[in-house]
């Protein structure tokens, strides 16, 4: 059994998240993940999910009673999602930590926008014709 | 020329982001994107970058002078990054809109954690042995 399972059960107790009523009104993440089978699509969604958990854990960083559980889960996320590549995790965390209200960050983001947009399409899909075909799909 | 280019230039003027000094102290996104060639790694990073721009644009949604530019750029992001797939964009936006301080959201997130973790590794890399190898890389 992966180390995170026991620690996640501990968090369930702490957050009172074990009851069946928690599942009322649908899921947050699981339903969305079920929609996407392509690896690159899954990464788009999982990137947001992992950053959500990191933010959640950050909010409870001073709560000693769950520190070990949180650290174990974060480490296992690092192994599973970032393939234990610290550079990947560091770059990810830099991106999640940029403040959207910081004026210098705003200026930089707008300054880089054209180049960022140019890189958004996967390499195989950069043909203009291909993109214009895409405009009409729901 | 893609439609976003002219509109991004318009935003540069609005944000006073055309000056060379904006590039001082390194880039926000471009340096990070340069580090990642694998499509799935790029999607992890681009997911955070796109959500940053969406948040930034949301903060300026009431500013009429840049509305057309913002809408054009968002639409082009939809074409390029979400492949004009509305379901993909909708799922993405759901994820970005969850509030990490909402108690019900917290409980649901912790309730789903074990299943989310189980799905984090790419299908081909779920072997326990492969993952344990990864524990020791920087």
């Amino acid at each position: 059994q992966d180390p995170y399972v026991k620690e996640a059960e501990n968090l369930k107790k702490y957050f009172n998240a074990g009851h069946s009523d928690v599942a009322d009104n649908g899921t947050l993440f699981l339903g969305i993940l079920k929609n996407w089978k392509e690896e690159s699509d899954r990464k788009i969604m999982q990137s947001q999910i992992v950053s959500f958990y990191f933010k959640l854990f950050k909010n409870f960083k001073d709560d000693q009673s769950i520190q070990k559980s949180v650290e174990t889960i974060k480490e296992d996320m690092n192994v599973k999602f970032f393939n234990s590549n610290k550079k990947k995790r560091d770059d990810f965390e830099k991106l999640t930590n940029y403040s959207v209200t910081d004026l210098n960050v705003q200026r930089k983001a707008i300054h880089e926008l054209i180049q960022v947009m140019a890189e958004l399409s996967p390499a195989a899909k950069t043909g203009k014709r291909k993109r214009s075909q895409m405009l009409f799909r729901g | 020329q893609d439609p976003y280019v002219k509109e991004a230039e318009n935003l540069k003027k609005y944000f006073n982001a055309g000056h060379s000094d904006v590039a001082d102290n390194g880039t926000l996104f471009l340096g990070i994107l340069k580090n990642w060639k694998e499509e799935s790694d790029r999607k992890i990073m681009q997911s955070q970058i796109v959500s940053f721009y969406f948040k930034l644009f949301k903060n300026f949604k009431d500013d009429q002078s840049i509305q057309k530019s913002v809408e054009t750029i968002k639409e082009d992001m939809n074409v390029k990054f979400f492949n004009s797939n509305k379901k993909k964009r909708d799922d993405f936006e759901k994820l970005t809109n969850y509030s990490v301080t909402d108690l019900n959201v917290q409980r649901k997130a912790i309730h789903e954690l074990i299943q989310v973790m189980a799905e984090l590794s790419p299908a081909a890399k779920t072997g326990k042995r492969k993952r344990s190898q990864m524990l020791f890389r920087g």
Partner: antibody
Framework: EVQLLESGGGLVQPGGSLRLSCAAS????????MSWVRQAPGKGLEWVSA????????YYADSVKGRFTISRDNSKNTLYLQMNSLRAEDTAVYYC?????????????WGQGTMVTVSS | NFMLTQPHSVSESPGKTVTISCTRS????????VQWYQQRPGSSPTTVIF?????PSGVPDRFSGSIDGSSNSASLTISGLRTEDEADYYC??????????FGGGTKLTVL
């Protein structure tokens, strides 16, 4: 101050066994993954084995897989390398190395090394 | 598996600047951190650069590390060379299937 002190090296015949130890001090031992790296005489560095802080996960280089076993005793702040079926090509200085995920995978602290000679 | 290739030896006079390269054979150099280790004769290795360009405390700022994606290589630059810099220098990195790989080492001679 971090200290890593290896012991247990020596001369052994091909096919024989040795157990290396590394006594650690100056840091919270159980919080860190530990590794063994070796260096044959006049040659470069070669990573041998690693173990997680809890001891629950281990990994080995192909060249030693099935012959070497890494372990740790967190109550004694000690790392071990059990080496069986030794070969001439295992002759090297063996370094005990502390590393941390939060220092970018750099091998931050190295012991002084213990010499293992496999010869008949 | 990939390899990291370093020059066998380099030499330079005291006070000058020397650069040691480390070229990755396959995979992308920038997608994983590179470390550099110094090993003086008869001593254990010590880290002089980690995470591409960061110096551990105690390592002088004469030592700097960099990555060049276009040549798929990392570099260690030592400026203001001193006799005590004479040592072997090793680069090290990893990828998704190989936990750690060391370069073959470069012998730096200070003339």
């Amino acid at each position: 101050e971090v200290q890593l002190l290896e012991s247990g090296g020596g001369l052994v015949q091909p096919g024989g066994s040795l157990r290396l130890s590394c006594a650690a001090s100056g840091f919270t031992f159980s919080s860190y993954a530990m590794s063994w790296v070796r260096q044959a005489p006049g040659k470069g560095l070669e990573w041998v084995s690693a173990i997680s802080g809890s001891g629950g996960s281990t990994y080995y280089a192909d060249s030693v897989k099935g012959r070497f076993t890494i372990s740790r005793d967190n109550s004694k702040n000690t790392l071990y390398l059990q080496m069986n079926s030794l070969r001439a090509e295992d002759t090297a200085v063996y370094y005990c190395v502390k590393r941390s995920f939060d220092s970018g995978g750099s091998f931050e602290y190295w012991g002084q090394g213990t010499m293992v000679t496999v010869s008949s | 598996n990939f390899m990291l290739t370093q020059p066998h030896s380099v030499s330079e006079s005291p006070g000058k600047t020397v650069t040691i390269s480390c070229t990755r054979s396959s995979g992308y150099i920038a997608s994983s951190y590179v470390q550099w280790y110094q090993q003086r004769p008869g001593s254990s290795p010590t880290t002089v650069i980690f995470e591409d360009d960061r110096r551990p405390s105690g390592v002088p700022d004469r030592f700097s590390g960099s990555i060049d994606g276009s040549s798929n290589s990392a570099s260690l630059t030592i400026s203001g060379l001193r006799t005590e810099d004479e040592a072997d220098y090793y680069c090290q990195s990893y990828d998704d299937t190989t936990p750690w790989v060391f370069g073959g080492g470069t012998k730096l001679t200070v003339l």
